[in-house]
Structures are given as C-alpha cells and as structure tokens.
C-alpha cells in the first residue's frame, strides 16, 4: 500500500538521486515506489516476442502494460501485454496505446478533449504561463496535436517516458511521476535481482545512458548483498 511503501524504514536510507535518476538498460526505469501512476518503458519488438514477466506497468514497453494473460487468471503471474488500441476495452490508462487514454472503460484518443492529468500538466508547463489554467491543471478542452507532442522537460509531470524530452525518462517520485535525467557514467543506479524487490524505494531511477550498463561497483564486490552499490559503467 501507499502507506507501507512511504513509511518503510528502508526509504529513509536511500542514496540521493544522483542526477535525479538511475537504472539499467534491462528495464528502462528501475522500478521503485509503486504508488500512483502507470506507464510503460521497456521496449520490446513484436517480432520474436517473448512474454516478459512483470510486477507493474513500468517494467513493460511504451506499447505494453502489465497484467495477467488470462482474464481472472493468477494475479501473481503477470506479463507484459500489447497495449489496447482505440475503442478497445480498458481498466486503466496504461492499458491504452500511446496517444490514447482510458475513459469509461474504453481507450479513446488523447486529442479528444480529455487528457490524463500528468499529460495535461506536462503540456501546461511546457507552454509557460497559461493564464487560463489554475494551479497547473489544464483546461479540459481540445489542444492541437502540436501541443500534445511537446516533450516534457526535467521536472514535468509525465505518464510515460515518451512524454519526456530526449535524455529524460518518466519515473516515479513519491506520489507522482516526473521526467528525470537518464544516468551518466559513474552515477548510482538500481539493479533489481528479483521481481517485486522495488517495493521499498522512494523514487524510480532512469536507465543508464547509451553505452552504459548498471553493474556492481568493482570495489564493492566483497560487500554484503544488501549493501552492494551499482553504478552506470561502460560495457
């Protein structure tokens, strides 16, 4: 629950979010405090498709969501499933393909008047002082496709990594998701060794940048498993 995640003791002892983010290529956003907003990040091609086990939407690609493969199936067995296209049934926003959101159980186009809250704020913030908004909530009126495709800058609220500008990913921070920088060489990253091990983290870290992977720091090999420090290192 939100309460157990945010009040856990482990939260208080996390390293600071160097550069605002961290992670590894194996899962574009290192999963963290599973609090509120869904969105996919781990890209997979349709060709040669392998079911990818997941615990939440963040562990899947931008065109996928995390769910049980069979209706009413074992909730403990979840895989990344292809996103639902327009007019298909849905239960939450992450189930709908990019450019769509879930409204009244149906995936509808995001350029049809209503936007998911995070995308609304990203648009508002990207366009500066829109005096027709109040406290960062956009008017729920049609916005041009040009506006919709504006990428969120660092700190903007987002739904998926595709909402963020180049060099940023969409990652959780407390009760929200914001665009954070992709990690540079030497920065601390998070590597999860088992499904669901992210439950105690307070923020998500982005993946390591191009040509880098999240590996245990050489001088930490002797440390206990629980205290091993991972950093972004050259392949």
């Amino acid at each position: 629950t939100l309460n157990s995640v945010l009040n856990s003791n482990a939260i208080k002892n996390l390293p600071p979010p160097l550069g605002g983010a961290a992670g590894h290529p194996g899962s574009a956003v290192s999963a963290a405090p599973g609090i509120l907003y869904p969105g996919g990040n781990k890209y997979q091609t349709i060709d040669n498709y392998q079911p990818y086990p997941c615990a939440e939407d963040e562990e899947c690609g931008t065109d996928e969501y995390c769910a049980s493969p069979t209706r009413g199936g074992d909730a403990g067995v979840q895989i990344c499933l292809a996103c639902r296209k327009r007019r298909k049934r849905c239960m939450r926003h992450a189930m709908c393909c990019p450019g769509n959101y879930c409204k009244n159980g149906i995936c509808v186009s995001s350029d049809q008047n209503h936007f998911r809250g995070e995308i609304e704020e990203t648009i508002t913030e990207s366009f500066g002082n829109d005096h027709s908004t109040l406290d960062g909530y956009s008017r729920r009126t049609t916005l041009s496709s040009k506006m919709y495709h504006t990428k969120g800058q660092e700190g903007s609220v987002c739904l998926r990594s595709s909402d963020c500008a180049s060099g940023l990913c969409c990652a959780r921070h407390f009760w929200s998701k914001i665009c954070k920088p992709v990690l540079k060489e030497g920065q601390v990253c998070t590597k999860h060794r088992r499904k669901g091990s992210h439950g105690l983290e307070i923020f998500q870290r982005c993946y390591c940048g191009e040509g880098l992977s999240c590996r245990i720091q050489k001088d930490h090999h002797q440390a206990s498993n629980s205290s091993r420090l991972h950093t972004c290192q050259r392949h």
Partner: antibody, heavy 117, light 107 residues
Amino acid sequence: EVQLLQSAAEVKRPGESLRISCKTSGYTFTEYTMHWVRQMPGKELEWMGVIDPSNGDTSYNQKFKGHVTISADKSSSTAYLQWSSLKASDAAMYYCSSTTGPWFASWGQGTLVTVSS
Amino acid sequence: DIQMTQSPSSLSASVGDRVTITCRASQDISNYLNWYQQKPGKAPKLLIYYKSRLHSGVPSRFSGSGSGTDFTFTISSLQPEDIATYYCQQVHTLPPTFGQGTKLEIK
C-alpha cells in the same frame, strides 16, 4: 476551475473528536492525490500526510501517524482529516492540497481548529 | 527528517528592489525544491517547483536557482503585491519539509 472548499472553523475541547472536510470540484477527484498540511499560529507549514482517492491508500508523516486519520469519499469528491481525541497542541490552521506532482499546486482556504478547555 | 533553513527570517525592501532569499537543506536534495508565497490569512501559493520552474500564472519576476543543498529565490523587481511570507520546501525525501519562512516587508 480547480476548487478546494474546506469546512468552517471549529472550536473544541481537549479529548473531543473532530472531522474536517475538503470538498473538491473542477477536476477528477481520483486522478490527483490529496494532502493535508498543518500551520500552527505564527509557525511554518508541516506536511501531515497524503491519500490517493482512487484506492484509499494513505501515507503519514511519522509525527502525525496514529493521531490523525486521512480518508476520502469518492462519491462526494471530498477528503477528510479526523482526530479521535484532540489535544491542546492540535490548535492550528489546516489546509488540504491537491496535486499530481511532487509539489502542492492547489490549496483549500484552510480550516482553523481551536482547542481549549 | 531533512531540515530546511531559510535566511533571512525577515527583510525589508523598496519597490523595484531586487530581493534574494536563501534556503539551505541539511542534506543533498538535488533539484527537489519548491517555493511558496503566503499572504496573511491566506493559503500558500506555489510559485516555483523543481528548483527553477515557474508555476503556471506566476509572474516572470520570480525565479529560483541552486542545487544540492543551497538554493536561492529571487524577485527581480519587488512589487507592492509581493508583500508576503515565502517558504521553501524539499520534496527529495519523505516527509516533505518546509523552511521556517521569510517575511518580506516594504520599506
């Protein structure tokens, strides 16, 4: 237009129970988290806790945990802050704040709680 | 909890002056710093979030800078309506914590 309308000022005695409310309008209640912030007379702001109205999940500042309860009613788009037994030190202004980001964007006008014997 | 220390606790300036308020965190908070304005008897208003991003509808005379532990809030040209108490807030680590406030008055 996002609006957060808080309940009227309250005057209570120590040991009494109290529930104050924050009624929202102008946005989808379940899509934004609701926070409660305390401000004692002449003092700074203190974050008390947060609720996700979509599922009722809550998180509290350890300082307030066990002493207050945050809840939400989706049908009326209203959030609540309640005490089962007030203390004199609970006398303060209480604000609700609704947001999606790690900042507090929209605020209620505040509810002044006076506790005196 | 992370402690936020603002300075000065109060200051007096003239209309048109450049005003600077500083906020120091007890540990590194990266860019996770917000600034609020509170006028007497009113609720706080978000001015700046994520260290330097201007909130919607906020005049451009307000700005924020800094990183890590030391942050600065600036009003480039003080206006009469800017008389208020200003608070910094860290949102790097739970619980979010606020500075003690800086009361701004007109000379």
